[in-house]
């Protein structure tokens, strides 16, 4: 009998409000044994896959998707889904990335720390991305 897969969580480091030109890393978490994590965007057809999965704790695995230099085009809702053979999980809730112009420079510490979406934030809107596919093992230095 197939196990019931828990929904993934998604968070952003250093936060969800990122100055233009700064970096952000999306962290997707799921159970141990995940083979592939996928990061999707609401109403966008693009996605990123990675098989670079590390163990975050005895019961959790994670993958990190980094955007080196955030632009206005990177703003919007993101969500994670993972593949643990032989099936995919449900999608996480969406996490909204906000990109703001800043006069403080790229190292300005005015991001919101610890932002994440577990099963309590905005519900997944299944109207667009249920049918996504995947690219292999992309490092997120060059996301989108």
């Amino acid at each position: 009998q197939e196990e019931d897969l828990p929904r993934p969580s998604i968070s952003a480091e250093p936060g969800t409000v990122i100055p233009l030109g700064s970096h952000v890393t999306f962290v997707c978490r799921g159970p141990v044994g995940v083979q592939t994590f996928r990061l999707e965007r609401e109403s966008r057809s693009t996605y990123n896959d990675t098989e670079d999965v590390s163990q975050a704790s005895p019961s959790e695995s994670e993958a990190r998707f980094r955007i080196d230099s955030v632009s206005e085009g990177n703003a919007g809702p993101y969500r994670c889904i993972y593949y643990k053979p032989p099936k995919w999980s449900e999608q996480s809730d969406y996490l909204e990335l906000l990109v703001k112009e800043t006069s403080g420079g790229p190292d300005s510490p005015d991001t919101e720390p610890g932002s994440s979406a577990g099963p309590t934030q905005r519900p997944s809107d299944n109207s667009h991305n249920e049918h996504a596919p995947a690219s292999q093992g992309l490092k997120a230095e060059h996301l989108y």
Epitope: T36, S43, R44, S45, T46, Y47, N48, D49, I81, Y83, P85, P86, K87, W88, Q91, N126, S127, H128, N129, E130, H131, A132, P133, A134, S135, Q136, L138
Partner: antibody
């Protein structure tokens, strides 16, 4: 990397027919597969799709007339009770890496003829 | 149901000329959009997706633009080999309306 359709043949109206899309050289679990058909001399017509995450979609005209299912290496299109209007070349296609919107990998097609 | 309206149905242009094909979606479809080229007896070939990214191996004479509900394919410096039928497709609708739909096609004749 390729996809190939099989199962197309001549059948009489009302005879169930199953077409199979077989994936080679890539892991099917990561991809959406769509089925498209083209009647002789006509345009492309979307039938439906099987998504990487296990969802299945159908064009409104195809609901109840076809069933799409997948295994780890194939995606099947079952025509439950075909009519002469279903005579066409049937294609399956896989989307491009990193973007769900474009289907870059197409099979050569398989010809289905429904005739009494 | 999502409907893609493609115009014109046929267009003729001389070698070296420019052809513009338009596609209108009945609802906003985000970036879930692509253009395909098909020649008689062949499978469709992906040209543009997302909706302005050039597919691998496609020359930059082909350009896609648009967003929301209005999309355009422009073929410049037309070559004889460009004679084909071109289709637009969206595959980003919702569960209730079916997420795949093709335009009716545009036959491009090169003189």
């Amino acid at each position: 990397q390729s996809v190939k359709e099989s199962g197309g043949r001549l059948v009489t109206p009302g005879t169930p027919l199953t077409l199979t899309c077989t994936a080679s050289g890539f892991s099917l679990y990561k991809y959406n597969i769509q089925w498209v058909r083209q009647a002789p001399g006509k345009g492309l017509e979307y039938i439906g799709a099987s998504t990487y995450a296990g969802y299945t979609y159908y064009a409104s005209w195809a609901k109840g007339r076809v069933t799409i299912s997948r295994t780890s290496t194939t995606v099947d299109l079952k025509m439950t009770s075909p009519t002469t209007e279903d005579t066409a070349t049937y294609f399956c296609a896989r989307h491009i890496d990193g973007d769900y919107s474009g289907y870059a990998l197409w099979g050569p097609g398989t010809l289905v003829t429904i005739s009494s | 149901e999502l409907v893609m309206t493609q115009t014109p149905a046929s267009v003729s242009a001389a070698v070296g000329g420019t052809v513009t094909i338009k596609c209108q979606a009945s609802q906003s479809i985000g970036t879930w959009f692509a253009w395909y080229q098909q020649k008689p007896g062949q499978s469709p070939k992906l040209l543009i997706y997302g909706p302005s990214k050039l597919a691998s191996g496609v020359p930059p004479r082909f350009k896609g633009s648009g967003s929301g509900t209005e999309f355009t394919l422009t073929i410049s410096d037309l070559e004889c080999d460009d004679a084909a039928t071109y289709y637009c497709q969206s595959n980003g609708g919702s569960i209730s309306n079916g997420w795949g739909s093709f335009g009716g096609g545009t036959e491009v004749v090169v003189k």
